[in-house]
């Protein structure tokens, strides 16, 4: 039960006090007791319950009422059973007793009131009225946890607007209200109660720029909502009528968890005694609700696809046809960004990452816009954000970014268990340098901080700075699987490729050509590739880099070797010893459920079939996956990217609720 106020009683004049239902009020009977009195007894109206604790127990008088010694060991507390119909309608009488004097009486007139701030602290999607209870003030994780949840109102329900809904202090319509969390103030008081008392709703100054509270007046219509708390307003006096009354508030978060904001927001209602005009108002009671701002959550390849994004650029019609066909097979919506909007920037994966935010009453997809800001920079904000589609960005918006700030360098694993630690929403993966040096590339600290602050997908730093482009999607991917952990990790593997080519040469296919059918490309015989010592040395270095990540992933994701599939792939070291794919990088694939769009490798044709394609199919088809090889050679591969780099996917949110985990 919540702590109420302390009431001091005195025999000199009657005391008037307010007692909030659900709170425990302390009664100070000792400090004003007559000097020659040594004990006291208590009589109350039926609506008041008094509890007296003392060691040793008191003696019972023959009249039936008990007396207690007047000493500091006595604790008197009272609670009220119901709200008062009129002011002071409940009474407590303290009788002080002494050996030589008649009893001296002290009177306490109590007014019982109900004042409670409620929100969906049980996370059921409904607000249940709660009396003032201690546990509303704490937010706990896990299936038995409690505490309310707020969404950042980061979508744009008004198609005419260019701003996010949380950037204005208006409620557009009932759709906009659904992005907010309901909070209800319930009051039950005597009719004249608020002539002498006032309620104030407030938020800490340190949190005021993270939240906005709208008060719904006269019904719940959006047009009747007005801002009462927000970035410019940490407190608001409430006009509350006497009697029984419910007041609804709609709460929106304005900021995601981040370095200096753990995501918790406390809203408090304070009851002030304003009865003495010449004196400052005194706090009589406070009730609070703690909200946690819902984190931004990424979705792995194992989640069902819902929408595919791709760019239309000069001469990529065939690529578009292939992606369109794949999206149709996977029953996905397809969104094509036209040339006039992408400004010759085809790297859809690098521009954005689509995740979601979730509260018990609402789930919202949210696009995380990377700070790379090339030709596609307007696409997330102008074409993706919209009604029920949120937006967030981090990092410098002008300069100061590296290639590692593009979101081909941001992936997430499927759910994993590492020892005793469960990651039911998977773990974020991003690439970094091995160690900081004058020219090493890292993901911008603002991005790293944001990702870590979400708490629910603890990030893992991989090593990717050895690549020309430097993105994790150049050497890893995840595909769904029907067994084991429900997925396989795919890793690019020069070792596996050399093994395959060696086998083909041993079988007499050393003259088979890589890049057959590619115009203006020097075709390479298997035997020449195998005998090129420089290329072998380069791939030995690449293998070491990938193996470093392999061990890191096994450790951080709790994987065994049998959870990993090696995809044959060769790399070449280019300027400044940075690696890029020697032939189209097959691990850089588009995963749409069981349908995979894999870069066509143009490997050696043996018995009428590309041996690289055949090998990959033999590895993935037993998992129930369907491999489609997409020609991206001229439009993507020679520009340092592949199918995954050129596409993006919105996926179905997890069925697992983030608040049920323990980070």
């Amino acid at each position: 039960m919540a702590q109420g106020t302390l009431i001091r009683v005195t025999p000199e004049q009657p005391t008037h006090a307010v007692c909030v239902l659900g709170t425990l009020t302390q009664l100070d009977v000792c400090s004003s007791a007559p000097e020659d009195c040594t004990s006291f007894s208590v009589n109350t109206s039926p609506g008041v319950v008094v509890d007296i604790a003392h060691s040793p127990p008191a003696k019972k008088k023959s009249t039936g009422s008990s007396t207690w010694p007047l000493d500091p060991g006595v604790e008197v507390t009272l609670t009220m059973k119901a709200a008062s119909g009129s002011t002071g309608d409940q009474k407590v009488q303290i009788s002080y007793h002494g050996p030589k004097t008649p009893p001296v009486k002290a009177l306490l007139y109590l007014t019982g009131v109900e004042i409670s701030l409620s929100a969906d602290i049980t996370r059921t999607g409904k607000v249940k009225p709660t009396r003032a209870v201690e546990d509303k003030r704490t937010w706990t994780w896990g299936p038995c946890g409690q505490g309310a949840i707020l969404l950042v109102n980061c979508d744009r329900d008004n198609p005419e607007s260019s701003a996010m809904d949380c950037e204005d202090d208006e409620v557009l319509d009932s759709k906009d209200l659904k992005d907010m969390s309901l909070m209800t103030l319930s009051t039950k008081t005597p009719q004249d109660f608020f002539t002498r008392h006032t309620l104030v709703l407030h938020v800490a100054r340190s949190e005021m720029d993270k939240v906005r509270v709208f008060q719904a007046t006269r019904g719940r219509l959006s047009s009747r909502c007005r801002v009462v708390l927000g970035p410019k307003q940490p407190s608001h006096y409430l006009m509350v009528p006497g009697g029984k009354h419910n007041m609804d508030f709609y709460v929106e978060a304005l900021a995601f968890p981040d370095t200096n904001f753990p995501g918790l927001i406390t809203l408090t209602v304070s009851m002030l005694d304003t009865s003495k005009l010449e004196l400052p108002e005194a706090v009589v009671f406070q009730d609070s609700v703690v909200f946690r701002v819902a984190p931004w959550i990424m979705t792995p390849n194992t989640q069902p696809p819902q929408e595919v994004y791709v760019c239309s650029i000069f001469e990529n019609e065939d690529f578009l046809k292939s992606v369109t066909a794949l999206a149709m097979q996977a029953r996905c919506k397809l969104t094509i960004c036209p040339e006039e909007e992408n400004m010759d920037d085809q790297w859809m994966q690098d521009e954005m990452e689509i995740g979601y935010i979730q509260a018990p009453h609402k789930t919202l997809p949210v696009v995380f816009d990377s700070p790379r800001n090339r030709g596609l920079k307007e696409f997330p904000i102008k074409r993706v954000m919209g009604p029920d589609f949120g937006y967030v960005t981090r990092g410098p918006q002008t300069g100061g970014v590296s290639g590692l700030d593009s979101f081909g360098n941001l992936e997430v694993s499927p759910p994993v268990t590492v020892g005793d630690k469960e990651y039911p929403l998977g773990r974020i993966l991003f690439g970094d340098s091995c160690y900081p040096s004058s020219d090493s590339r890292e993901m911008h600290q603002a991005l790293q901080d944001f990702l870590s602050a979400q708490q629910v997908q603890a990030p893992v730093k991989l090593y990717s700075d050895w690549l020309t482009v430097g993105h994790v999607d150049e050497f890893l991917s995840f595909v769904p699987a029907p067994d084991r952990k429900g997925f396989r990790l795919l890793l690019a593997s020069p070792r596996s490729c050399y093994k395959l080519f060696q086998e083909q040469q041993n079988e007499g296919h050393g003259d088979a050509l890589l890049f057959q059918g590619i115009k203006k490309k020097n075709q390479q015989k298997i035997k020449n590739i195998l005998s090129n010592t420089t290329l072998r040395e380069h791939n030995s270095f690449v293998e070491r880099c990938i193996d470093w990540n392999r061990e890191l992933l096994k450790r951080e994701l709790g994987l065994a070797e049998s959870d990993i599939i090696d995809i044959p792939q060769l790399f070449k070291l280019k300027e400044f010893s940075k690696a890029e794919a020697f032939f189209p990088n097959m691990v850089n694939m588009l995963v749409l459920g069981k349908h995979l769009g894999i870069p066509k490798p143009f490997g050696p044709i043996i018995n009428g079939r590309c041996c690289l394609e055949e090998k990959v199919c033999s590895l993935l088809e037993p998992l129930g996956l369907h491999c489609t090889f997409i020609n991206d050679f001229y439009t993507y591969h020679i520009r340092h990217g592949e199918v995954h780099c050129g596409t993006n996917v919105r996926r179905k949110p997890f069925s697992f609720k983030w608040w049920n985990m323990v980070p």
Epitope: S402, G403, S438, R441, N522, Q524, L535, E575, F576, I638
Partner: antibody, heavy 128, light 111 residues
Framework: QVQLVESGGGLVKPGGSLRLSCAAS????????VSWIRQAPGKGLEWVSF????????YYADSVRGRFTISRDNAKNSVYLQMNSLRAEDTAVYYC?????????????????????WGRGTLVTVSS | QSALTQPRSVSGSPGQSVTISCTGT?????????VSWYQQHPGKAPKLIIY???ERPSGVPDRFSGSKSGNTASLTISGLQAEDEADYYC???????????FGGGTKLTVL
């Protein structure tokens, strides 16, 4: 073959900033590595900065690191050198140079380390 | 002070051969085969004449040749001509924090 033209040079006070541009014609600059080289009056060549064709990594000389930023806009067929906190010793003719990033290369041909096409240069004078 | 060391000047008569040396360390010239040479006439932009130690871009006469031994690279110009009079700079990839280094330049005078 690509032709390069530098612009943006001029007189600036110590501590000031300038942004040099290198515009390409005759070919698509996105296929080229680009470097900036400078030459102080009467002195030798000094390598300043490099950006790769994919626009994914950059390098700088110790003497300019943290003050200069190289960037490219392939849509505009241009490369830029943003120079901040300029010092008297940055006074020089700044050359933009490039080398083709040939996808046919099997192994590192060193194209990022040599400059086969040069612009005419733009003079930057840092003086109070 | 330049990172790669070249003689300040060399000279030769028309028809003769001259060699310009470029000395670095085991972290640049000695480590990589990414040595290049540039010719610069007064008031003009430099011009690439040798790359990757000994390769010549198209249009560069075969009188210009490059070589490397240990930490020293060399440019040899045979059959000197009057138009060869210019400044010559060597350059190398380096594993230091400045990844491309130039020599201080050598003034070639054709007598």
């Amino acid at each position: 073959q690509v032709q390069l033209v530098e612009s943006g040079g001029g007189l600036v006070k110590p501590g000031g900033s300038l942004r040099l541009s290198c515009a390409a014609s005759g070919s698509t600059l996105s296929d080229y590595f680009v470097s900036w080289i400078r030459q102080a009056p009467g002195k030798g060549l000094e390598w300043v900065s490099f950006i790769n064709s994919a626009n994914t990594f950059t390098y700088y000389a110790d003497s300019v690191r943290g003050r200069f930023t190289i960037s490219r806009d392939n849509a505009k067929n241009s490369v830029y050198l943003q120079m901040n906190s300029l010092r008297a010793e940055d006074t020089a003719v700044y050359y933009c140079s490039s080398a083709n990033d040939d996808v046919d290369d099997i192994v590192a041909p060193g194209r990022g380390y040599y400059m086969d096409v040069w612009g005419r240069g733009t003079l930057v004078t840092v003086s109070s | 002070q330049s990172a790669l060391t070249q003689p300040r000047s060399v000279s030769g008569s028309p028809g003769q051969s001259v060699t310009i040396s470029c000395t670095g360390t085991s972290g640049d010239v000695g480590r990589y085969n990414h040595v290049s040479w540039y010719q610069q006439h007064p008031g003009k932009a430099p011009k690439l004449i040798i790359y990757n130690v000994y390769e010549r871009p198209s249009g560069v006469p075969d009188r210009f040749s490059g070589s490397k031994s240990g930490n020293t690279a060399s440019l040899t110009i045979s059959g000197l001509q009057a138009e060869d009079e210019a400044d010559y700079y060597c350059s190398s990839h380096s594993r230091s924090s400045t990844p491309v280094l130039f020599g201080g330049g050598t003034k070639l005078t054709v007598l």
